[in-house]
Structures are given as C-alpha cells and as structure tokens.
Interface confidence: low
C-alpha cells in the first residue's frame, strides 16, 4: 500500500487503528482457515500473508476452535445454507444489525459476526462469486468499526476475547454464539 503522506497515529492495544488492524488479521486468518477446510486451495483467498505476533496467533487459535465447534451445529448450518445470496449486502447488514439490536455487546456476538462473514464467503466461493469475498470482509470490518469498535476499546482491545473464551465453559459459550446467530437468521428469514 502506498502510505506516502500518511502520518502515523497511536498504536496501543485499544487504539482504533490497532483494533481494526488486528480485526482485519483475525478475519482474514479465520476465513482462510475455514476455506482451507473445504478442501483444495482457493486462489481468490490468496491474500497477502501478514506476520502475526504471539498475541494474534493465540486469538486466531481461539477463533479456530470456536469455528470448529460452530461447524458441528447442524441447526445453524441449516439456517446458513438457506440464506439467499442474491442481495448479500442487505442480508449481511440486516443479520449483523440484528445480532446487536438489543444494545448488548459481548465477545460471543463478535465471533458470531466473523463466523457469519466466513460462511457468506464460502457460499460466494461455491457459487463462483469470488469478487464478493473481499467485499464481505470489507462489510465485516465496516460493521466492526461503526458498531463494535467503541465496545472493543472498552474491553481493553482484542485480548478480552481470550479471557472470555479462555474458561473451561467455552463450549457453553459457543452454544450461545450459535444461538445468537440462529436467532438473527430466523428473524431475517421472517422479514425477508
């Protein structure tokens, strides 16, 4: 990227730049990992590899683990399979907005947002709409910046995710994540 003329801004763990950059790294890694599990390489997902520090690697592992758990939730998979991708932007923002519509923020919902984005990307790959992939990533980061950034800052940055899911009851939390996403998809289906 051409950064000439761009002046550096604050870079602590709760700075908006750092949260967005870490979020972009986590989202990219999460989507690439999920696509890799589909079998075969997806050239459309050959985004520039970005070095991850130890903290981001831990977060990526945490997300991977939750993603695996969500993959085995049949009800959630059925709901996602039924999503109509004719108007993906409308679907994405409606489902995403509904997830947070009650004004309550938690890490489970943030992960649910990433998971939903990854599933939309995989649907795009399956239906041969590769140009949607970066676009969906963009929507996710847009939503994160516009609706979740302040809350993530209040949690002390992304590391709050580790303490949230780093407990013995993380499987229970994952069930909750699936519930949030399933409920939002149900509402979307009814409205759509």
């Amino acid at each position: 990227m051409d950064g000439s003329g761009e002046q550096p801004r604050g870079g602590g763990p709760t700075s908006s730049e750092q949260i967005m950059k870490t979020g972009a790294l986590l989202l990219q890694g999460f989507i690439q990992d999920r696509a890799g599990r589909m079998g075969g390489e997806a050239p459309e997902l050959a985004l520039d590899p970005v070095p991850q520090d130890a903290s981001t690697k831990k977060l990526s592992e945490c997300l991977k683990r939750i993603g695996d758990e969500l993959d085995s939730n049949m009800e959630l998979q059925r709901m996602i399979a039924a999503v109509d991708t004719d108007s993906p932007r409308e679907v994405f923002f409606r489902v995403a907005a509904d997830m947070f519509s009650d004004g309550n923020f938690n890490w489970g919902r943030v992960v649910a947002l990433f998971y939903f984005a990854s599933k939309l990307v995989l649907k795009a790959l399956c239906t041969k709409v590769p140009e949607l992939i970066r676009t969906i990533m963009g929507w996710t980061l847009d939503f994160l910046r516009e609706r979740l950034l302040g809350w993530i800052q209040d949690q002390g940055g992304w590391d709050g995710l580790l303490s949230y899911f780093g407990t013995p009851t993380w499987q229970t939390v994952t069930i909750f994540v699936a519930g949030v996403l399933t409920a939002s998809l149900t509402i979307w289906k009814k409205m759509g």
Epitope: M1, S4, G5, S16, K21, M137, D142, E146, L149
Partner: antibody, heavy 127, light 107 residues
C-alpha cells in the same frame, strides 16, 4: 505531500450539468475512500457522496441521489462528481476529501474521518 | 438516517477558557465520530477521529470523548487561533452526516 485539487466549478443554469474533478497526489487513491462535501454560502457542511475505488462502491446523500454520480479513475489518481439536473439549492462550495485507508487491502466502504481536504470549487446554479 | 444534533450553535469565550461542544446522535453510532475545525474561506481540518483519537499534528488542548450517544469536543485552554466553527461528523453504514456547526467567537 498529500494534496487534493478540485476543478470544474462555475456558473450553470438550473437543469444543467457540471463535472467536478479532484486530482490527488502524494498517495494512491486506490487505497482510500474519497468523499465530496459541500457548503452552501453561510451554511454548514453537507456530505454529498463517497466512493471506495477498491470496490467501486458508491454512496449518496438522499438530496443528490439519482442526479449526481461519483466516480474515480485510479490510473489518473482522480475522483469525479458528475452533477446533472442541477437546482438552485445545489449552489455551494464543493470540497473533495480523503477518507480512511483500507487495512491490508480490504477495509470496506471507508466512510470515516476525512483527513485531507481540497481548497474547494464554487458551483453556482442560477438563471 | 442518523442525525447529529450539535450544541450550542454559537458561543462567546475568552482566551484561556475551557470550551465544550456536544453532539448527540439520534441512535448508536459506536465511535465513528470525527470533529473538524473550519475558518472562514478555508477547508475544514480534522481534529479528532474515532470519537477520542487526536489527529496527528493537532495540539493536545483538543480532546474528544464519548458517553453513549453523546460526543464531546473539549478545548482545555482556548487560544487566539481557535476562534472558528467546529463540526462533528458521524459515519454509519457508509452514510455520513455532519452536525450543524458551533461558531466559537471572541467575548
């Protein structure tokens, strides 16, 4: 050094058209969102339109939707605002401004803080 | 669309005064709020982004904060060059709105 230079303003009759240009230098326009913001004489700032050249996504204020078209030519590092069916109420100084950078090549629509602005170009719609 | 209600519309203050300008969003906009300073005949200048981050090169007497849907710009000690009009701006779902502006005049 980052610079934005607008051109194309002038006097036009109601119903007429104008095309504004915003020549960018000191950065690669492909990686940033670009915005047009206007200011009627003695009034406040009003957002008009935005574009994310990386995606070609465009967004418009309700007041100009269907009449104005924002575009960008990344090879010329220039953003444009095509204004059709102009009305007296479109009279204003039009500024182009640079929005947020994309993170790792995909940031989204980038509707964000505008860190660099042009000097503005005056559009007068009058008979 | 989200509206940004800015207050006051104008204020008179003296050099050295602490000045506070508020913008209230009609609904939650997280931290996607910026503040600008504009002087007559000039383009706006970015002061604060992400509600509370100070833009590079902006004096530290400027600060921003967020409390729910209320966003505040504070000038801790007003300087002669700070007499200008200030605008807040929000971004939500790629649509942008500005506050009506606050003119800071010399008392």
């Amino acid at each position: 050094e980052v610079q934005l230079v607008e051109s194309g303003g002038g006097l036009v009759q109601p119903g007429g058209s104008l095309r504004l240009s915003c020549a960018a230098s000191g950065f690669n326009l492909s990686y940033y969102s670009m915005h047009w913001v206007r200011q009627a004489p003695g009034k406040g700032l009003e957002w008009v339109a935005s574009i994310s050249p990386y995606y070609g996504y465009t967004y418009y204020a309700d007041s100009v939707k269907g009449r104005f078209t924002i575009s960008a030519d990344t090879s010329k590092n220039t953003a444009y605002l095509q204004m059709n069916s102009l009305r007296a109420e479109d009279t204003a100084v039009y500024y182009c401004a640079r929005g947020g950078a994309y993170y790792f090549g995909y940031y989204g629509s980038g509707s964000y803080a505008m860190d660099y602005w042009g000097q503005g170009t005056l559009v007068t719609v009058s008979s | 669309d989200i509206q940004m209600t800015q207050s006051p519309s104008s204020l008179s203050a003296s050099v050295g005064d602490r000045v506070t300008i508020t913008c209230r969003a009609s609904q939650s906009v997280s931290s996607a709020v910026a503040w600008y300073q504009q002087k007559p005949g000039k383009a706006p200048k970015l002061l604060i982004y992400s509600a509370s981050s100070l833009y590079s090169g902006v004096p530290s007497r400027f600060s921003g904060s967020r409390s729910g849907t209320d966003f505040t710009l504070t000038i801790s000690s007003l300087q002669p060059e700070d007499f200008a009009t200030y605008y807040c701006q929000q971004s939500s779902y790629s649509l942008i709105t500005f506050g009506q502006g606050t003119k800071v005049e010399i008392k």
